[in-house]
């Protein structure tokens, strides 16, 4: 009987192909050369290996690259990526956006796993900042990605990257995150004309200070109530009734439906009743 550590005669793998699915785990371990596996990683995904067999292949790569896999291997990991732990991924140096896309594709349709989060973190740190192409890629796979970053992490986003941000990418951002993103957006869109500027800046206005809201009120922007409801309370409170009326334009009537909700309630409470009455909406301070 052949020892389990020795490859049976005639079973030594010459290439990574479908015949390997019939190998027992110990045979894969004994008969597949790690260097061969590394050079033919792109073939692994076309072969229906079991999870147990994939564990063996991962083990072989781990032995070959104890300090972490090279990017040439990482790019072709495919479903083997799902076998990686965050600790494995922390050893990697991923610099190619194509590699990142290939691995994100494997996890597509699922929530962001700890493995993916670690991969993205390694990639972004390696680049030094969250550039536009990276942000484009990440938000395409994970629309909530931007809002998963801490305010400190968001501070490394250059204003030029803001062009890649879509309104839905900001849906789950909290006020502290918008406080960081708004000044970057203001800078990014500063050369646009009034109406175009408002369309772009609108989804970032949850971080806008009072002075900017006052300025917008002079530009006939007709802010919708959904945007107004996301404004910072401290930015809304100093606005006069006349300024809010100008800011909202025809949408001012929507205040009535939101009078019990913040920040509308906070604002109403601090206005003179005579001023509120000029709106003709029956708002009670």
């Amino acid at each position: 009987e052949v020892e389990k550590t020795a490859c049976p005669s005639g079973k030594k793998a010459r290439e990574i192909d479908e015949s390997l699915i019939f190998y027992k785990k110990w045979e894969l371990e004994a008969c597949v050369d790690a260097a061969l596996l590394a050079t033919q990683m792109d073939r692994v995904n076309a072969i229906p290996f079991t999870y147990e067999q994939l564990d063996v292949l991962k083990h072989k790569l781990d032995e070959l690259y104890p300090q972490g896999y090279p990017e040439s291997v990482i790019q072709h990991l495919g479903y083997l990526f799902l076998k990686m732990s965050p600790e494995d991924i922390r050893k990697w140096n991923v610099t190619s956006l194509e590699t990142l896309k290939a691995l994100l594709e494997v996890n597509k349709g699922h929530e962001m796993s700890p493995q993916v989060a670690t991969l993205i973190d390694r990639f972004v740190k390696g680049r030094g900042q969250l550039d536009k192409d990276t942000l484009d890629t990440l938000t395409a796979f994970y629309p909530g990605y931007l809002c998963s970053l801490s305010p400190e992490e968001l501070s490394s986003v250059p204003p030029s990257s803001i062009w890649a941000v879509r309104p839905q990418d900001l849906d789950t951002c909290d006020p502290r995150q918008l406080d960081v993103l708004y000044p970057k957006a203001r800078l990014a869109f500063q050369n646009m004309n009034g109406s175009e500027y408002f369309v772009k800046i609108q989804s970032f206005l949850g971080g806008a200070p009072t002075e900017d809201l006052k300025a917008l009120s002079q530009q006939n922007v007709s802010m919708d109530l959904a945007t107004f409801m996301k404004l910072r309370t401290d930015a809304v409170l100093p606005l006069t009734v006349a300024e809010v009326q100008k800011l909202l334009g025809p949408h001012v009537e929507g205040l009535k439906a939101e009078e019990r909700h913040r920040p509308v309630r906070d604002w109403i409470l601090r206005q003179r009743q005579d001023d509120l009455d000029t709106l003709g909406l029956g708002l009670q301070g």
């Epitope: 909290d174 006020p175 502290r176 309370t233 401290d234 909700h261 409470l269 301070g285």
Partner: antibody, heavy 119, light 107 residues
Framework: QVQLQESGPGLVKPSETLSLTCTVS??????????WSWIRQPPGKGLEWIGY???????NYNPSLKSRVTISVDTSKNQFSLKLSSVTAADTAVYYC???????????WGQGTMVTVSS | DIQMTQSPSSLSASVGDRVTITCRAS??????LNWYQQKPGKAPKLLIY???SLQSGVPSRFSGSGSGTDFTLTISSLQPEDFATYYC?????????FGGGTKVEIK
């Protein structure tokens, strides 16, 4: 710094009116950014918000208690008060007054006063 | 009224454990959610406001996250003084409501 102190009878008879006062020290009840709330907690149970008042006199009450509650403010005494009418044993609780800061929430609380409704 | 549902209602944990408490609102409340800690016989204490902002003087092991309807309070490494009852509270709607509370007990 701002401190709150509840005062009032610890025992009230059923069907009578519960009256409590909260005295604000180290700050002003006329603060632009603050509302002043009453919150209660029956023994062994969770917290229930009763209502709030702004220094202007504007009030807002818990819908389930609205018909029985009156909250008032006396800016000259730096106090606000709670009146709860037609009390029953179900109103037995620790009653807290609290500052509701517009930016942070209930950031300052009184130490609470136990009110028992019993004949 | 907006209902606030906390889970679990109680949990047992050891010093050093990572503890997570969740709070769900019956409708969207944006980020208008606060977390409080209450110890027996004491008034509640504000820990987190606006869903994720740490109140002054509160240890950094406490953190909050979430927006819309789902929120989380996390204690990264439980300390002996953290055994208490925790409440979430929404201030989005004018009728403020609290969650039912989560009692954190010693295992």
């Amino acid at each position: 710094q701002v401190q709150l102190q509840e005062s009032g009878p610890g025992l009230v008879k059923p069907s009578e009116t519960l009256s409590l006062t909260c005295t604000v020290s180290g700050g002003s009840v006329s603060s632009y950014h603050d509302l002043w709330s009453w919150i209660r907690q029956p023994p062994g149970k969770g917290l229930e918000w009763i209502g709030y008042i702004y220094y202007s006199g504007s009030t807002n009450y818990n819908p389930s208690l609205k018909s029985r509650v009156t909250i008032s403010v006396d800016t000259s005494k730096n106090q606000f008060s709670l009146k709860l009418s037609s009390v029953t044993a179900a109103d037995t609780a620790v009653y807290y007054c609290a500052r509701d800061n517009v930016f942070t929430g209930f950031d300052i609380w009184g130490q609470g006063t136990m009110v028992t409704v019993s004949s | 009224d907006i209902q606030m549902t906390q889970s679990p209602s109680s949990l047992s944990a050891s010093v050093g454990d990572r503890v997570t408490i969740t709070c769900r609102a019956s409708q969207s409340i944006s980020s208008y959610l606060n977390w409080y800690q209450q110890k027996p016989g004491k008034a509640p204490k504000l820990l987190i406001y606006a869903a994720s902002s740490l109140q002054s003087g509160v240890p950094s092991r406490f953190s909050g996250s979430g927006s819309g309807t789902d929120f989380t309070l996390t204690i990264s490494s439980l300390q002996p003084e953290d055994f208490a009852t925790y409440y979430c509270q929404q201030s989005y709607d004018a009728s403020y409501t609290f969650g039912g509370g989560t009692k954190v007990e010693i295992k």
